[in-house]
């Protein structure tokens, strides 16, 4: 039951991240007009991935697309390449968990295959989310260094009578948006990867392992105790003894160790 | 069409208090801005303070101690109320919509205020 | 706060004539973001309350002649009327539309000679 929750509560957290993902990648406000220490303007700036955009006070509102793909900092084609990895790393996932989730029945899927499919989209998420967290960063590195260098533009260089006004951008509501959704799409992978471990069938939890005595032939059946250390029991060379017919649920109802994380 | 009217007083004494209104057809206060600017008999135009579309404001430095403007947007009406008026005061009040570039494309025919006691 | 000089104060012209006049600001116009400078330019004649000819320093009002033309950047611009007409006879303003307040220039007076 835990495991089932665990998944379903990575895969709506990792879809919402996504989601905010996509959201932050298509916003325009990726760095806006500082309006602090400035003259009052009537004309607010602001710039996203693709496009920039002037709003007037009278409402007025005006956007120009980056036509040029060679004339764009590489900086900025680095973002957007991050973003994109992201976005497609993450809808990928989102398709994997969707097959994976316990919840739902696929023909005869093995659990061990969902418990492969809920790692892969898990790590995916995982990639997914820094991605985008390492594409907002860079770009908010690159506002901070431009910041500071047209700071010291305002305050050099204005012997003459003619002022210019420096237009200095900060943070904009898509590098915030950015942030928060790369982090949950990262908690959701994290999910993931945890509930998967729960999800892998431990064979020596419900199987009856054959030891041989001289002699003797008894057969033990551990109770709660299990001898394995990996996701799965390595049962190479071991005799294995069903324990008797159960259903796929009883089997799965078994407490693991892993379903209380 | 797009129209704007303004009304006052005409005279007021001086140290008194001033409000004009500005009302305004063919358009919604909630997507315009609306300027006011006076000009003096015989001189140049003096941009006083606007209120912009959502409601806020900015006005002439030298005169934002005495100036407020205000609108009531289910009267398509804007106000201008000045404070503590004396005789340089006396001016034409032209009321004027903001368009692109935050240029004003249509005005008002003006009021003239005269502060004379 | 910014100051917006215009000059001359007055023209003495012909019609037929082309005639330029300028008008200077104390702050740069330019805004870097849509590579457009605020500056306004308005014809007022007698009596009447302005009229807009030309925004973002070169677009003109539609409904203007195109012999009005407007142009520069930053912080000096022109208005230039390629034939004077008798009733272009007026006072022409600039405006900052960039920085607050949004100053007007001096005015300058077009006269017939």
């Known amino acids: 039951m835990a495991v089932t929750a665990c998944q379903g509560l990575g895969f709506v957290v990792s879809l919402i991240g996504i989601a905010g993902i996509i959201a932050a990648t298509c916003m325009d406000q990726w760095s806006t007009q500082d309006l602090y220490n400035n003259p009052v303007t009537a004309v607010f700036n602001y710039q996203g991935l693709w496009r920039s955009c002037v709003r007037e006070s009278s409402g007025f509102t005006e956007c120009r697309g980056y036509f040029t793909l060679l004339g764009l900092p590489a900086m900025l084609q680095a973002v957007r390449a991050l973003m994109i990895v992201g976005i497609v790393l993450g809808a990928i996932g989102l398709l994997v968990s969707i097959f994976a989730l316990k919840c739902i029945r696929i023909g005869s899927m093995e659990d061990s295959a969902k418990a492969n499919m809920t790692l892969t989209s898990g790590i995916m998420f995982i990639v997914s989310g820094l991605c985008a967290i390492a594409g907002v960063s860079v770009f908010a590195n690159m506002l901070v260094t431009n910041f500071w260098m047209s700071t010291a533009n305002m305050y050099t260089g204005m012997g003459g009578m003619v002022q210019t006004v420096q237009t200095r951008y900060t943070f904009g509501a898509a590098l915030f948006v950015g942030w928060v959704a790369g982090g949950l799409t990262l908690i959701g992978g994290v999910m993931m990867c945890i509930a998967c471990r729960g999800l892998a069938p431990e064979e020596t939890n419900y199987k009856a392992v054959s030891y041989h005595a001289s002699g003797h032939s008894v057969a033990y059946k551990p109770g709660g105790f299990k001898a394995s250390t990996g996701f799965g029991s390595n049962t190479k060379n071991k005799k294995i003894y069903d324990g008797g017919a159960r259903t796929e649920d009883e089997v799965q109802s078994y407490p693991s160790k892993h379903d209380y994380v | 069409q797009v129209q704007l009217k303004e009304s006052g007083p005409g005279l007021v004494a001086p140290s008194q208090s001033l409000s004009i209104t500005c009302t305004v057809t063919?358009?919604?206060?909630?997507?315009?801005?609306v300027h006011w600017v006076r000009q003096p008999p015989g001189k140049g135009l003096e941009w006083l303070g606007v209120?912009?579309?959502?409601?806020?404001?900015n006005y002439d430095s030298a005169l934002m101690s005495r100036l407020s403007i205000s609108k009531d947007r289910s009267k398509s009406q804007v106000f201008l109320k000045m404070t503590s008026l004396q005789t340089d005061d006396t001016a034409m009040y032209y009321c004027?919509?903001?368009?692109?570039?935050?240029?004003?494309?249509?005005w008002g025919q003006g009021t003239t205020l005269t502060v004379s006691s | 706060d910014i100051v917006m000089t215009q000059s001359p104060s007055s023209l003495t012209v012909t019609t037929g004539e082309k005639v330029t006049m300028s008008c200077k600001s104390s702050q740069s116009l330019f805004n870097s973001g849509n590579q457009k400078n605020y500056l306004t330019w308005y014809q007022q004649k007698p009596g009447q309350p302005p009229k807009l000819l030309i925004y973002?320093?070169?677009t003109r009002e539609s409904g203007v002649p195109d012999r009005f033309t407007g142009s520069g950047s930053g912080t000096y611009f022109t208005l230039t009327i390629s034939s004077v007409q008798a009733e272009d006879l007026a006072v022409y303003y600039c405006?900052?539309?960039?920085?607050?307040?949004?100053?007007f220039g001096t005015g300058t007076k077009l006269e017939l000679k």
């Open positions: 004027a919509r903001s368009l692109y570039g935050n240029s004003f494309d249509h």
């Open positions: 405006q900052n539309n960039y920085i607050y307040p949004l100053a």
């Open positions: 063919g358009f919604s206060l909630s997507s315009y801005g």
């Open positions: 973002w320093a070169s």
């Open positions: 209120i912009w579309a959502g409601g806020s404001t």
